[in-house]
């Protein structure tokens, strides 16, 4: 039966025409089917450190050793790939860190960092200086081992000069890259030497080259792409959102739930109310009111703004967010204080949201 | 290892309801919706609703919102699907499905034959 | 609801040929999932989340698209491949699958 009893049959809208609502990346750590891996939680003053994979729990067993700030993985299986976090408990607050483990059979480190282009890549040489092709800008082509969820867009780069300018072509396993090798073909953007490959499936896993050349010699640098294959997995809420806020009367507050979802997430907030004079219906389950959710005429529904709060909003909110595999839900309590009682802050904002990809 | 097992075949009478269930092994029942879905006889998948055992949370697909109630169990881990006032279209194959840690599971599906 | 368009109904082909199935959302939707379905059978899960492969899937499948328009291909036909394909949309309640493409041997 219901946990709860909504107070008003609310008729929710149809859910927006899905954006990519998941930004950031976590970082990725790859490892072969047996391999033993190591990873440390990179959290500083951390007094307590708990872990958990795809948010359950992640406990001591056979294969799985947590030391200090260290998880250790013994003979890894494609099971154990994941999203994993860990959550440093201080005194005063927690703070959690994420990142995905696969287990696959490709050798691959760390994932593709979104370069902004740039025309300065583009050298013009004086006509008189002939030249044979050089590296501009080696830094960008320092990781050659590129990781990459499914789906995500790749872009590899190869800065160049040389006089005259050189041309680039590009090659895939040691052969000529050409459009129909992948389906939706790619992109060279010769001003800023790079090959951008969208929607990455795993068929695009491999060595990517890039050759310049100008009359003068010819350079070659090799990149690894892997791509990561993901796992759905209910959504994941961060730690600590929504935080606990006060206000005075007629003061503002904003609550802001973080998730970490594949499949796109639906998310509710949701407010315990009375209905004459009760929290309670006659089942004995609580009053609940849906306040925003995610939806066409709902914008950023991971933050609930209230404006303008009066005593009757004190209470406990709760972020409720659901994908097609499960739930999660957390919430946070809302204390208003008489004009005279402000606290240090009037407003309580956290930080903004982003979705994790 | 995961396990969805549905129970067996019904013939009913027009207007007669029906009972499915769908018997979990393997994995945590409450914590994943339980989905259910049709498949009337040569034809396509039809998406019927879902429930969250954790709370009984249900989401129904409007076309069958007054045709099927869906209920869980939770100390059997067993999902069920009552389909009300049978006619003949409802005829078909019913299946649970739904994900358990990084998998999709399907149940062997359920056959339900109106005819009078 | 978002209808999913599935073309062709039936595509006829022999082992060894490439075969592209194509699925057309509505409106657009973040992923797309297929499931491959034989006679007398429950359907079974063959790619998520628009390009990954479901345990034991082979490697001659591939899945790709976004937004609008997702494509299942099958790069080298085998005997046991010919079947029923679905694609289905988890994006938006309800939830919704396509018709179908039948794949059958030519």
């Known amino acids: 039966r219901p946990s709860f009893s909504l107070v008003e049959d609310t008729t929710l809208e149809p859910e927006e025409p899905p954006t990519k609502y998941q930004i950031s990346q976590p970082e990725v750590y790859v490892a072969a089917p047996g391999e033993s891996l190591e990873v440390r939680c990179l959290l500083k003053d951390a007094a307590v450190i708990s872990w958990t994979k795809d948010g359950v729990h992640l406990g001591p067993n056979n294969r799985t050793v947590l030391i200090g700030e260290y998880l250790q993985i013994k003979g890894a299986t494609p099971r154990d790939s994941g999203l994993y976090a860990c959550t440093a408990s201080r005194t005063v607050d927690s703070e959690t860190w994420y990142f995905m483990v696969n287990v696959t059979d490709a050798i691959s480190s760390g994932d593709d960092e979104d370069d902004t282009d740039g025309a300065e890549d583009f050298v013009s040489e004086n006509s008189n200086n002939k030249r044979a092709p050089y590296w501009t800008n080696t830094e960008k082509m320092e990781k050659r081992l590129h990781a990459v969820p499914a789906a995500n867009t790749v872009k590899f780069r190869c800065p160049a000069g040389g006089n005259p300018m050189p041309t680039m072509r590009w090659l895939k396993n040691g052969k000529e890259f050409k459009q129909e090798h992948r389906i939706g073909g790619y992109k060279v953007r010769n001003q800023h030497w790079s090959l951008i490959m969208e929607s990455v499936v795993p068929s695009d896993k491999g060595n990517y080259t890039c050759v310049v050349e100008n009359e003068y010699g010819s350079i070659n640098h090799t990149y690894h792409l892997d791509v990561v294959e993901r796992s759905p997995h209910r959504p994941i809420l961060q730690a600590g959102l929504p935080a606990n806020a006060s206000t005075v009367v007629g003061g503002d507050v904003e609550f802001v739930c973080k998730v970490y979802s594949d499949a796109q997430p639906h998310i509710q907030w949701i407010k315990h109310v009375e209905k004459n004079g009760s929290k309670y219906g006659p089942d004995g389950l609580p009053y609940l009111k849906v306040l925003k959710h995610s939806g066409i005429n709902s914008s950023n529904a991971e933050v609930l703004a209230l404006f303008n709060v009066t005593e009757a909003d004190a209470g406990e909110y709760i972020c409720k967010v659901s994908n097609y595999i499960g739930q999660a839900n957390q919430s946070a309590w809302l204390t208003v204080l008489p004009k005279q009682q402000a606290p240090g802050r009037e407003k309580e904002i956290t930080a903004s949201p982003d979705y994790l990809e | 290892q995961v396990q969805l097992v549905q129970s067996g075949a019904e013939v009913k009478k027009p207007g007669a309801s029906v009972k499915v269930s769908c018997k979990t092994s393997?994995?945590?029942?409450?914590?994943?919706?339980m989905h259910w879905v049709k498949q009337a006889p040569g034809q396509g998948l039809e998406y019927i609703g879902a429930?969250?055992?954790?709370?009984?949370?249900?989401d129904y697909n409007q076309k069958f919102k007054g045709k099927a109630t869906l209920t869980a169990d939770t100390s059997t881990s067993t999902a069920y699907m009552e389909l009300s006032s049978l006619r003949s279209e409802d005829t078909a194959v019913y299946y649970c499905?739904?994900?358990?840690?990084?998998?999709?599971?399907w149940g062997q599906g359920t056959l339900v034959t109106v005819s009078s | 609801e978002i209808v999913l368009t599935q073309s062709p109904a039936t595509l006829s082909l022999s082992p060894g040929e490439r075969a592209t199935l194509s699925c057309s959302a509505s409106?657009?939707?973040?992923?797309m999932y297929w499931y491959q379905q034989k006679p007398g059978q429950a359907p079974r899960p063959w790619i998520y989340?628009?390009?990954n492969l479901a345990s034991g899937i082979p490697a001659r499948f591939s899945g790709s698209g976004s937004g609008t328009d997702f494509t299942l291909t099958i790069s080298s036909l085998e005997p046991e491949d010919f079947a029923v394909y679905y694609c289905?949309?988890?994006?938006?309640?309800?939830?919704?699958f396509g018709g179908g493409t039948k794949l059958e041997i030519k």
């Open positions: 499905t739904g994900y358990a840690y990084d998998a999709a599971y």
């Open positions: 393997g994995y945590t029942f409450t914590s994943y919706w």
């Open positions: 429930i969250y055992p954790e709370n009984a949370d249900t």
């Open positions: 409106s657009s939707v973040s992923y």
């Open positions: 989340l628009t390009s």
């Open positions: 289905q949309q988890w994006s938006s309640p309800p939830y919704t």
